[in-house]
Interface confidence: low
């Protein structure tokens, strides 16, 4: 099991790393959209894990910028976000398309609705039960 | 950017609070890091207060140094103070990754003299 | 505590050189090391995370290695403004949190 765990931290961190570089190969990007939004999770550890990930940054700002799939619904009251972002968006997560072209990236401001807790945790509980 | 401040000479003994002013980022967002630096001397992790506002320090740190912070600052205090406390004391932003961390956004410092 | 110590502690290259700084760890930290570039009256400047990656705009003549307990940084085809003071960081917080500098390598370049 340990093993596995250790698979699949290194699996998330190439998916982190290389996200949103290649737009004809997105499966495993949206594969972890998925786990992100189901789990209500953000990164492998901690959001911040993103915040690294040259593809996601903005332009020389202090924003930083995490896939759309990190965002939590439930505590964004902001209706243009919802509307024009992020809603699109989760949608096509929620009804697990594989149509996307490119990876779908929502910035950070800096009070920011993203889930807190990192996906490790609740993916190690997931490989434990299972 | 980070801003340091409250660094000034003290007897030993003494109390101090250092503060840490942050702008352009949210401390909702992310940890801050204390680090400081004797003359002449190498960097020394002090202590870390992360996004939630839980607190860790380095063994030798805990006891006599508290971070805490607020909306916009972060406060490092200090008590029993010695002579060997006598350093610059930097604050730091930190970003993790993958269970490890790193500083990459720093303070200028502010120098805190401990003398009788 | 984890102990990180650095050696050499000074080392002198001519421009245009290669320079080696090694790091160990007292325990196993994985990959969970950063190197920092510090100069005189300068707060330390991030130069390599997670061991091996170098962030945006740092020089790919810095290239961090190794896991576990050992750990190298290296700098080739030197320049003067690579006269510095480097640190090695273990910063494990995937557990208990851990962290601590170890004592730095000047580099002098001739």
């Known amino acids: 099991r340990a093993q596995l765990e250790r698979s699949l931290r290194d699996v998330v961190e190439k998916t982190i790393q290389k996200y949103g570089t290649n737009p004809e190969e997105t499966a495993a990007e949206e594969s972890w959209d998925y786990v992100q939004f189901q789990l209500r999770c953000c990164g492998w550890h901690y959001p911040q894990d993103w915040f690294q990930v040259l593809i996601l940054r903005g332009n020389g700002s202090e924003a930083h910028r995490v896939p759309c799939s990190c965002y939590n619904l439930s505590a964004t009251n902001d209706s243009t976000i919802l509307d024009k972002v992020i809603l699109p968006q989760l949608s096509r997560l929620g009804h697990l398309a594989r149509s996307r072209h490119s990876a779908d990236i929502c910035a950070v401001p800096a009070e920011s609705h993203i889930y807190r807790e990192g996906c490790a945790q609740g993916l190690q509980k997931w490989l434990h039960n299972n | 950017s980070v801003e340091e401040s409250g660094g000034r000479l003290v007897t030993p003994g003494t109390p101090l609070t250092l503060t840490c002013t942050v702008s352009g980022f949210s401390l909702s967002n992310y940890n801050m890091g204390w680090v400081r630096q004797a003359p002449g001397k190498g960097l020394e992790w002090i202590g870390v207060?992360?996004?939630?506002?839980t607190t860790y320090y380095a063994t030798w740190a805990k006891g006599r140094f508290t971070c805490s912070k607020t909306s916009s600052t972060v406060e490092l205090k200090m008590t029993s103070l010695t002579t060997e406390d006598t350093a610059t004391y930097f604050c730091?932003?930190?970003?993790?990754?993958?269970?490890?961390?790193?500083?990459?956004?720093w303070g200028q410092g502010t120098l805190v003299t401990v003398s009788s | 505590d984890v102990v990180m110590t650095q050696t050499p502690a000074s080392v002198s290259e001519p421009v245009g050189g290669t320079v080696t700084i090694k790091c160990q760890a007292s325990q196993n930290i994985d990959s969970n090391l950063a190197w920092y570039q510090q100069k005189p009256g300068q707060p330390p400047k991030f130069l390599i995370y997670y061991a091996s990656n170098l962030p945006f705009g740092v020089s790919s003549r810095f290239k961090g290695s190794g896991s576990g307990t050992q750990f190298t940084l290296t700098i080739s085809d030197l320049e003067s403004a690579d006269a510095a003071t480097y640190y090695c960081?273990?910063?494990?917080?995937?557990?208990?949190?851990?962290?601590?500098f170890g004592g730095g390598t000047e580099v002098v370049v001739k």
């Open positions: 207060i992360d996004a939630s506002g």
């Open positions: 730091a932003r930190e970003l993790l990754y993958f269970g490890s961390s790193y500083y990459d956004l």
């Open positions: 960081q273990c910063a494990d917080v995937g557990s208990t949190y851990v962290a601590a």
